[in-house]
């Protein structure tokens, strides 16, 4: 299988956005690749985003994703919007080099993505 | 049920062009890659091009590669081959097909029918 | 190009019989190994995929085995409807290239 890196934790912003690297050693000579985000949560894993892409091209997630990502060589640097504290959990980044074949497929051990709220802000006296 | 029509099959004379279609239905059509495959007259089957769902990849056969295109217009879930001089080796039956599994060909057309000759 | 040899081309066999046809790359092919069966003027169908994955609605008497470079499509029970040519084909690397067919016939 091929090695997929992430980092171990990431901390949200106070916005609700988390951005983490995904990087992948390439066995051979991809020119498409996909890359899909997981989270696992209480043992369930479910797809958050995925994209494909031209080696040197941007990525392409769907209008509606909470994701966008940028590429550059076997590196992905994926960023996730509109998080919220329940959605903290393990985001796991997998990797298919899809084309020209063989196909290699990676899958990173997860970066533990921290969301936390915001406190309201008091209303203040003037 | 997943069905693959081809059409624009023909009679043509060597150095002619003729372009194929493929109307696909009964799956998500942007989701798939797609082939060409052809087959001579009593022969065995010849891979031709390939095309990814997004058509980002595509590839041909090395007696192909120049004189051939392929193309998809995922809008319209139709799949084409442009073939342009054209030889007496290209007459065949080509299939379309479906790659649903990586490197595999799941769904198959009917075929249509290539002859060249003078 | 990786070539692909079937053997026998053609065969012939008795309704029940356990009927086995083989297939051998040039190289290494890993487990990107797939068998399709055309019957006579008939559009190819996918039977096996990955060595040994029976495609849906396959008939469980059809089973696919090996590794590397050789590969065998074993029909365990031979019925009148599974006379057809039976092609191999590689999908490790481009070209995809196919056998050259197995034509198997009744007794």
């Known amino acids: 299988a091929m090695h997929v890196a992430q980092p171990a934790v990431v901390l949200a912003s106070s916005r609700g956005i988390a951005s983490f690297v995904c990087e992948y050693a390439s066995p051979g000579k991809a020119t498409e690749v996909r890359v899909t985000v997981l989270r696992q949560a209480d043992s369930q894993v479910t797809e958050v985003c995925a994209a494909t892409y031209m080696m040197g091209n941007e990525l392409t997630f769907l209008d509606d994703s909470i994701c966008t990502g940028t590429s550059s060589g076997n590196q992905v640097n994926l960023t996730i919007q509109g998080l919220r504290a329940m959605d903290t959990g393990l985001y796991i980044c997998k990797v298919e080099l899809m084309y020209p074949p063989p196909y290699y497929l990676g899958i990173g051990n997860g970066t533990q993505i921290y969301v936390i709220d915001p406190e309201p802000c008091p209303d203040s006296d003037f | 049920e997943v069905q693959l029509v081809e059409s624009g099959g023909g009679l043509v004379k060597p150095g002619g062009s003729l372009r194929l279609s493929c109307a696909a239905s009964?799956?998500?059509?942007?989701?798939?890659?797609m082939a060409w495959v052809r087959q001579a007259p009593g022969k065995g089957l010849e891979w031709v091009a390939f095309?990814?769902?997004?058509?980002?990849?595509?590839y041909y056969a090395d007696t192909e590669t120049g004189r051939f295109t392929i193309s998809r217009d995922n809008a319209k879930n139709s799949l084409y081959l442009q073939m342009n001089s054209l030889r007496a080796e290209d007459t065949a039956v080509y299939y379309c097909?479906?790659?649903?599994?990586?490197?595999?060909?799941?769904?198959w057309g009917q075929g249509t029918t290539v002859t060249v000759s003078s | 190009d990786i070539q692909m040899t079937q053997s026998p081309s053609s065969l012939s066999a008795s309704v029940g019989d356990r009927v086995t046809i083989t297939c051998r790359a040039s190289?290494?092919?890993?487990?990107?190994l797939n068998w399709y069966q055309q019957k006579p003027g008939k559009v190819p169908k996918l039977l096996i995929y990955?060595?040994?994955r029976l495609h849906s609605g396959v008939p469980s008497r059809f089973s696919g085995s090996g590794s590397g470079t050789d590969f065998t499509l074993t029909i365990s029970s031979l019925q009148p409807e599974d006379v057809a040519t039976y092609f191999c084909?590689?999908?490790?690397?481009?070209?995809?290239?196919f056998g050259g067919g197995t034509k198997v016939e009744i007794k």
């Open positions: 009964g799956f998500t059509f942007s989701d798939y890659g």
């Open positions: 095309i990814s769902n997004l058509a980002y990849s595509v």
């Open positions: 990955y060595i040994s």
């Open positions: 097909a479906r790659s649903g599994l990586p490197y595999a060909m799941d769904y």
């Open positions: 084909q590689q999908g490790r690397m481009l070209p995809w290239t």
């Open positions: 190289q290494d092919i890993s487990n990107y």
